[in-house]
């Protein structure tokens, strides 16, 4: 990109540049016009006969560098050939020299500074490349010579441009005088500033454009090279901010249309709304959630909204004893989610009626929550309670949900309870044919003791046929019409209004051999 | 000798037309420039038109555009000045003028009369 | 475009100097030329670009031009130099021409 400093051919009064020295055979300005017959003006000078060592010198106004460290001046010029001047002396010159001098203000007259190589710093020496032949009464014919001369490194606020001849007969048909920038550009949704180059390559800093922002990595910068153009370098440049994507060749963020969105920065395209989700602005980053529909805490913005599920379905329950086991089917609705899990809540409810949630002597296996699979058995039931169980199925968005969460409810009531297992039986004496026994009274949840079963037989004689039965109401029983010296195998059960309750364990003892043994009194 | 001599002039009626004519001699007349300037009797310089040397460009004065016309022939080294609807105010000496001139570039020329001719009045009475 | 103003007449003993000025918007920004013009004569140029002289103009006249104002300048005047003098300037309207109103320069 060019800046244009100063051009001969806009202006459009005037140049009255300052010439050196006042004499005839000076640098004078003309007027023509061009095509669109608009005014512009030129230098001649024709001074073909000077007296040695006099030169003729053309200084333009002050030119405001604008920042520019180099210039460039393009001259349009044609030149007479010195063959075609009948008046030519020897000192007929075909070049020119060109030379600046910089200031901080317009502070040159018409005699400073001196006029010569020394304040003003020479650029070049100008040969034309095309001579302008003239011959009497005829017009001039020759092509417009064009060179672009570089001056600087330039430091103070301006500079003049000067042009010295020492014997051409010649015309500057325009100065152009312009520095080089790098235009402003966006580039990978990057934007660098328009920029003048102050060295062979200067470093320039991105800045994001609207809606973008830094990528990962170095800050995005280009180099502006001093031909004011930018070096072809890749830049790790910018990428779109959620809910914008790129557009118009990567220059601008566009906002998502309602109803899609863009979760993350980055590259990528704005996406249509996941299931069950909407988003009615533009320049969404994530899309809303219908009306009960959620997402969990850790699901990626871009996923679907799901529902908690429905409750499961078809609980059955096999009881045993104070076990119970559950069963059941997965809900209908799994809400969208595969993280189904299942719980349960409990009450139990005593056989006078007072209900209570379920206390800690019960134990799930695996668990009472998080259960994976659709069964739990529940252990340590209460005899004679009714339970209530409601099992929930649940996923990650369950907690998310407000109002009640479905369940399928189960009842079971236990069996009233028995009495406990006789142990700790003693024989209180033994004699050859006979057995006194006793034992502690059981706990008896459900009412007291009514009467016990003494279960009995010989060591050794398993058939069904050698067990002997005996009834007592009181925790002690006497065994008669043994064998002498024989061992039994004995076994108690209390019973209760529930019931008889589960035989003792087997109880080991032995009737006496002889009678002048006596009565013994043995423990157990 | 270097010179431009006007001629046409006379005495003509409101609304008639008149053709100045401007001889030149003793320069090169295709790389000139020229103008008409004129002087009403007791008043001052006033340009007229201009006309650049290959004579594809024109000017006027408001004051008389759409009525004059100027034009040249090269060939001829003359320059011409049509003038119709011809008004009482146009009495006048008209000159003609040469435009200072480059010294080879006849697309371009100086900002000054450097050569004029003795002038011819035209009166314009019924 | 511009417009350029001069005193009608200025009076001036021989010997002395004479100036006659001619004033017009940023003036001293255009070129401006004078010439002179005695009675029942074609005008003469006697100052070009602002305070050139042609060849065989006499060295006593000179020319200026700052600001908004030209000035004629005639030192050590004689008779002959009583006359008319106009200056000129182009305009912007393509190849336009100005003149002023005209000064007539007396000697006393």
């Known amino acids: 990109l060019e800046e244009t400093l100063l051009n001969t051919k806009l202006e459009t009064a005037d140049l009255k540049w300052v010439t050196f020295p006042q004499v005839d055979g000076q640098w004078e300005e003309l007027s023509g016009l061009d095509e669109e017959q608009h005014s512009v003006r030129t230098y001649e000078v024709c001074d073909v006969q000077r007296a040695p060592g006099q030169a003729h010198w053309l200084r333009t106004g002050w030119v405001p560098r604008r920042g520019a460290v180099h210039v460039y001046a393009t001259l349009r010029f044609t030149m007479l050939e010195c063959l075609s001047l009948p008046r030519a002396g020897r000192s007929c010159k075909e070049t020119f020299t060109v030379f600046y001098y910089e200031s901080d203000a317009d502070t040159a007259t018409a005699l400073t500074p001196a006029w010569m190589e020394n304040p003003y710093i020479k650029v070049d020496t100008v040969a034309a490349e095309h001579l302008t032949r003239k011959r009497p009464g005829a017009e001039a014919t020759g092509k417009v010579n064009v060179k672009t001369l570089r001056l600087g490194p330039l430091s103070k606020a301006g500079f003049y441009l000067a042009f010295q001849d020492q014997g051409a007969c010649m015309a500057l048909l325009s100065l152009h005088l312009f520095y080089k920038k790098c235009a402003q550009l966006t580039v990978n949704l990057t934007r660098f500033p328009e920029t003048v180059p102050r060295e062979l390559v200067v470093p320039v800093a991105g800045s994001c454009v609207v809606d973008a922002v830094p990528a990962p990595g170095p800050s995005p910068s280009l180099y502006c090279r001093e031909d004011g153009q930018w070096a072809e370098q890749p830049v790790t440049g910018c990428s779109c901010a959620p809910g914008f994507e790129a557009a118009e060749g990567n220059t601008k963020c566009r906002a998502c249309a309602q109803g899609t969105f863009k979760p993350l920065s980055g590259e990528g395209s704005c996406q249509p709304c996941p299931a069950n989700s909407h988003s009615n602005t533009i320049g969404s980053a994530v899309c809303q959630c219908r009306v009960g529909y959620f997402r969990a805490r850790t699901d990626p913005r871009g996923a679907p909204c799901t529902t908690p599920p429905s409750a499961p379905r078809s609980v059955v329950s096999r009881l045993n004893g104070s076990s119970l086991h559950l069963e059941w089917s997965a809900p209908l609705e799994s809400g969208g989610r595969e993280d189904l899990t299942y719980a349960l809540r409990c009450r139990e409810c005593r056989p006078g009626g007072s209900c209570a949630p379920c206390g800690g002597d019960l134990t799930f296996d695996p668990g009472p929550r998080d259960l994976v699979e659709p069964w739990v058995v529940v252990r340590g039931l209460r005899p004679d309670f009714t339970y209530t169980f409601e099992v929930t199925a649940l996923n990650g968005v369950s907690s998310l949900a407000t109002g009640p969460v479905p369940f399928e409810p189960v009842n079971v009531t236990t069996d009233r309870e028995v009495p406990p297992a006789v142990s700790d039986i003693r024989v209180t004496r033994s004699s050859p044919s006979s057995l006194s026994l006793a034992w502690a009274v059981p706990r008896a949840p459900s009412g007291a003791v009514l009467d016990y079963e003494v279960k009995y037989h010989e060591k050794g004689a398993e058939g069904p046929s050698s067990v002997r039965f005996l009834k007592t109401s009181e925790n002690r029983a006497e065994l008669r019409g043994l064998k002498r010296g024989a061992s039994y195998l004995v076994q108690v059960r209390a019973r209760s209004e529930a019931g008889y309750g589960p035989f003792g364990q087997e109880h080991h003892s032995q009737t006496q051999l002889d009678e002048s043994e006596g009565w013994r009194e043995q423990l157990a | 000798q270097v010179e431009l001599v006007e001629s046409g002039g006379g005495l003509v009626q409101p609304g008639g037309s008149l053709r100045l004519s401007c001889a030149a001699s003793?320069?090169?007349?295709?790389?000139?420039?020229m103008s008409w300037v004129r002087q009403a009797p007791g008043k001052g310089l006033e340009w007229v038109s201009a006309?650049?040397?290959?004579?594809?460009?024109?000017s006027y004065a408001d004051s008389v555009k759409g009525r004059f016309t100027i034009s040249r022939d090269n060939s001829k080294n003359t320059l011409y000045l049509q003038m119709n609807s011809l008004r009482a105010e146009d009495t006048a000496v008209y000159y003609c003028?040469?435009?200072?001139?480059?010294?080879?570039?006849?697309?371009?020329?100086?900002?000054?009369?450097?050569?004029w001719g003795q002038g011819t009045l035209v009166t314009v009475s019924s | 475009d511009i417009e350029l103003t001069q005193p009608p007449s200025v009076s001036v003993a021989p010997g002395q100097t004479a100036r006659i000025s001619c004033s017009g918007d940023?003036?001293?920004?255009?070129?401006v030329h004078w010439y002179q013009q005695k009675p029942g004569q074609a005008p003469v140029l006697v100052i070009y670009?602002?305070?050139k002289r042609p060849s065989g103009i006499p060295e006593r006249f000179s020319g200026s031009n700052s600001g908004n104002t030209a000035t004629l300048t005639i030192s050590g005047t004689q008779a002959e130099d009583e006359a008319d003098y106009y200056c000129q300037t182009w305009t912007l309207s393509h190849m336009g021409n100005v003149f002023g109103g005209g000064t007539k320069l007396t000697v006393l």
């Open positions: 670009y602002d305070s």
């Open positions: 006309i650049n040397a290959k004579g594809q460009f024109t």
């Open positions: 003793g320069f090169t007349f295709n790389n000139a420039w």
């Open positions: 940023n003036l001293g920004k255009k070129y």
């Open positions: 003028a040469r435009k200072g001139m480059s010294f080879y570039n006849n697309k371009y020329a100086k900002s000054m009369f450097d050569l």
